[in-house]
Interface confidence: low
């Protein structure tokens, strides 16, 4: 039954509030080993970057994408690479840094995209359980049948940041994605050493606003890894 699923040990490793199941009797949730806690702080240890092998963009940080490190390199060897800034060449949205998307092979600002009549691609959501959803079927989210005619306000459902009003970005909240505020100076942010902590986190924060970067709070240097706070600070 649904209740036994919710109470079973099968979900004991899931971070909150993943212990729930969709309203379908008999549906089950299988835990993904090593799933990260919201904010990615549980496994944050050092700020210096180490190349991290990956198979897809979801395994990399918010400001990274997954690709071969050399042009025309071995497709079997991929690592998380730094995202591409505005006006840089791209092949897909994930290659562009937060606040940008890939249009005609160039990373452009999402702000320039006041309303796109077409959603370029259908996004497969990753729910931290091996890409399967609660009912065991792959969930593909598309807005083709219900376009956003007005920009989403804070807390409303979105597919990507361009669906949100100015000053907001689209970020995961539980198993949804909602419009959240772009972070201001001094606000708590999430520093991803690598992307495992991004693709699987159940809550996501927006990126820091222009001129800010996510760095460890000065008075938290002595704190344990699990309790370190990062805040948006001036470059």
């Amino acid at each position: 039954t649904l209740n036994s699923v919710l109470n079973s040990n099968a979900i004991k490793n899931l971070p909150p509030p993943l212990g729930g199941a969709a309203g379908h009797p008999g549906s089950a949730v299988s835990a993904a080993p090593g799933i990260l806690y919201p904010g990615g702080n549980k496994y944050q240890t050092i700020d210096n970057y180490q190349p991290y092998p990956c198979a897809e963009d979801e395994e990399c940080g918010t400001d990274e994408y997954c690709a071969s490190p050399t042009r025309g390199g071995d497709a079997g060897v991929q690592i998380c690479l730094a995202c591409r800034k505005r006006r840089k060449r791209c092949m897909r949205h994930a290659m562009c840094c937060p606040g940008n998307y890939c249009k005609n092979g160039i990373c452009v600002s999402s702000d320039q995209n006041h309303f796109r009549g077409e959603i370029e691609e259908t996004i497969t959501e990753s729910f931290g359980n091996d890409h399967s959803t609660l009912d065991g079927y792959s969930r593909r989210t598309t807005l083709s049948s219900k376009m956003y005619h007005t920009k989403g306000q804070e807390g409303s459902v979105c597919l990507r940041s361009s669906d949100c009003a100015s000053g907001l970005c689209c970020a995961r909240h539980f198993w949804s994605k909602i419009c959240k505020p772009v972070l201001k100076e001094g606000q708590v942010c999430t520093k991803h050493r690598r992307k495992g902590s991004h693709g699987l986190e159940i809550f996501q924060r927006c990126y820091c606003g222009e001129g800010l970067s996510c760095r460890i709070q000065k008075d938290h240097h002595q704190a344990s890894n699990s309790s370190r706070l990062h805040t948006c600070q001036r470059h």
């Epitope: 909150p16 199941a21 309203g23 459902v157 706070l229």
Partner: antibody, heavy 118, light 111 residues
């Protein structure tokens, strides 16, 4: 202006049932996930249950103490959230608040009182 | 009954600053940098004052601020005013059966 109005509370005997409703207005109800939070007389807040919006498959969560007895549901066409409460116990006596969960519980109704007593 | 630990009451004079603490464990508040604070006046519904540790929703006075270190979160109210007298609740997320946890509440008295 966001408005949430609860109804359906009242006096019920232990073991009885009650269905609470929450009428929402002033925002796109279907785009938000919603929750019920209760507060026993003179006590603190206690989360009861939450339900996602349609695009997230109406995923539901329940607090351990109500699991199997309470059922949360929603009707987007009516902009209404429901809480079906069965096998009620004295300890379920509380004011039940309907809350919009945008970024945390950002809007609350005024609550409806449920009293379970013989 | 899982709950975050808050002092039952705190008090301060107008113009002063007060801090309300909220202590949890590594399974709830300590494990997530997602702490919210709510204000509740008698007979009224709660109101979100702080989310994500230190973020204020629009319309909330900048006299209210939040912080967190380890398993403890804090709400600071500066320039205390009479209308700040209310109950304050912290809220976080937790592993296990209870997904959302609240503190027991703190009654703030403005002297």
């Amino acid at each position: 202006q966001v408005q949430l109005v609860e109804s359906g509370g009242g006096l019920v005997q232990p073991g009885g049932s009650l269905r609470l409703s929450c009428a929402a207005s002033g925002f796109t109800f279907s785009s938000y996930w919603m929750s019920w939070v209760r507060q026993a007389p003179g006590k603190g807040l206690e989360w009861v249950s939450s339900i996602e919006h349609k695009d997230a498959g109406y995923t539901t969560w329940y607090a351990a103490g109500v699991k199997g007895r309470f059922t949360i549901s929603r009707d987007n066409s009516k902009n209404t959230l429901y809480l079906q409460m069965n096998s009620l116990r004295a300890e379920d006596t509380a004011v039940y608040y309907c809350a919009r969960h945008g970024i945390d519980f950002d809007h609350w109704g005024q609550g409806t009182l449920v009293t379970v007593s013989s | 009954d899982i709950a975050l630990t808050q002092p039952a009451s705190v008090s301060g004079s107008p113009g002063q600053s007060i801090t309300i603490s909220c202590t949890g464990t590594s399974s709830d508040l300590g494990g997530y940098n997602y702490v919210s604070w709510y204000q509740q006046h008698p007979g009224k519904a709660p109101k979100l004052m702080i989310y994500d540790v230190n973020n204020r929703p629009s319309g909330v006075s900048n006299r209210f601020s939040g912080s967190k270190s380890g398993n403890t979160a804090s709400l600071t109210i500066s320039g205390l005013q009479a209308e700040d007298e209310a109950d304050y609740y912290c809220q976080s997320y937790a592993s296990g059966n209870t997904k959302v946890v609240f503190g027991g509440g703190t009654k703030l008295t403005v002297l």
